[in-house]
């Protein structure tokens, strides 16, 4: 039995997979900040987790996926206010009783030290210093990501 949050995540991911392939993104678009091979957009409005997920989708992007602790630290370095929380693309899967990224993979327990409970309707936020489990209905900011594609010997129009 999938929760409504899980269904929303799956639906949006599937619709993203169905969209036509676009040329590689060579540079970050205006307003997006480059962090290594990603472009990040920090929202300045607030939303529950599923609305944040949907907003990133409309921007042809996804909620932030964090590969490891190193990437977490570099992302946190871009957060300038101690008190502000941002949703990322990780929520608790009730059916699998584990933290699950929106790309379908599970959280490696060594990657993030989460403060708070792992339970139904819990989603993950990050601050300048920590990682928190919050009710998914909490309205906070969020971070979208686009992957930069290294493209060689090809010239594409402006992305």
């Amino acid at each position: 039995q999938k929760s409504s949050i899980e269904k929303c995540s799956v639906d949006i991911q599937q619709s993203r997979n169905k969209t036509t392939e676009r040329p590689g993104l060579l540079n970050c678009p205006i307003y997006w900040q480059q962090l290594r091979e990603k472009c990040l957009l920090f929202s300045h409005t607030v939303n529950p987790w599923n609305n944040s997920l949907a907003d990133c989708s409309t921007k042809e992007s996804s909620l932030l996926l964090i590969r490891d602790k190193d990437e977490l630290i570099h992302t946190q370095n871009l957060i300038r206010d101690k008190a502000i929380l941002f949703w990322i693309g990780l929520n608790f899967s009730l059916s699998e009783k584990n933290w699950k990224w929106i790309n379908g993979s599970f959280l490696n327990s060594n990657d993030l030290e989460i403060r708070g409970d792992a339970k139904e309707n819990s989603c993950i936020s990050i601050s300048q210093t920590s990682v928190y489990s919050e009710y998914c209905s909490t309205e906070i900011r969020w971070i979208c990501q686009k992957e930069l594609t290294p493209v060689r010997n090809k010239v594409y129009p402006d992305s």
Partner: antibody, heavy 116, light 107 residues
């Protein structure tokens, strides 16, 4: 209600640097993008650039080599510097809150004339 | 850069009439990232529409936006005396550019 107020000299000599400050009241400058836009009878409305905290700026490609936008969160202000000005830079300069591409709050504008 | 061309340059109408303003882009505007503003003499522009069709806070429902790709329209269903002004479109899909404006004047 967020309010923005531009301030700075109304007259700048050619080849000098135009400097303007925008003071934000009724809300925090933190966490938002803030832009400068100018308006001339000849070229109409022209976006100059934005600042986000102090970590990110972007400028109109046609002005990039001459523009610097900075922010002072402690004073709730952000500033514009435009170097090597000519008569073509004479315009009404507006500061605005930038909703990542469109502008929901504007200052009332300040006329800057470039003349010797 | 994306060039926005607004037409007509001037629209002469009477209060109560319907106004249809056009904004055409030189290339497709990504994700319908287009906004409309109203400007009165001596004032700053005022945001009316963003995302091609979403009304900004406090904007009356007689203002509506539509379109996608390269063709966008601002419609004022029934002109009120305070609606006579200059209207600008602006795209934010690829850098940021404004149209040249359409003046809506009293006939």
């Amino acid at each position: 209600q967020v309010q923005l107020q531009e301030s700075g000299p109304g007259l700048v000599k050619p080849s000098e640097t135009l400097s303007l400050t925008c003071t934000v009241s009724g809300g925090s400058i933190s966490g938002y993008y803030w832009s400068w836009i100018r308006q001339t009878p000849g070229k109409g409305l022209e976006w100059i650039g934005y600042v986000y905290y102090s970590v990110s700026t972007d400028y109109n490609p046609s002005l990039k080599s001459r523009v610097t936008i900075s922010v002072d969160t402690s004073k709730n202000q952000f500033s514009l510097r435009l170097s090597s000005v000519t008569a073509a830079d004479t315009a009404v300069y507006y500061c605005a809150r930038d909703e990542t591409g469109y502008f929901d709050y504007w200052g009332q504008g300040t006329l800057v004339t470039v003349s010797s | 850069e994306i060039v926005l061309t607004q037409s007509p340059g001037t629209l002469s109408l009477s209060p109560g009439e319907r106004a249809t303003l056009s904004c055409r882009a030189s290339q497709s505007v990504r994700s319908s990232y287009l906004a409309w503003y109203q400007q009165k003499p001596g004032q700053a522009p005022r945001l009316l529409i963003y995302g091609a069709s979403s009304r900004a806070t406090g904007i009356p429902d007689r203002f509506s936006g539509s379109g996608s790709g390269t063709d966008f329209t601002l419609t004022i269903s029934r002109l009120e005396p305070e609606d006579f002004a200059v209207y600008y479109c602006q795209q934010y899909g690829s850098s940021l550019t404004f149209g040249g404006g359409t003046k809506v004047e009293i006939k």
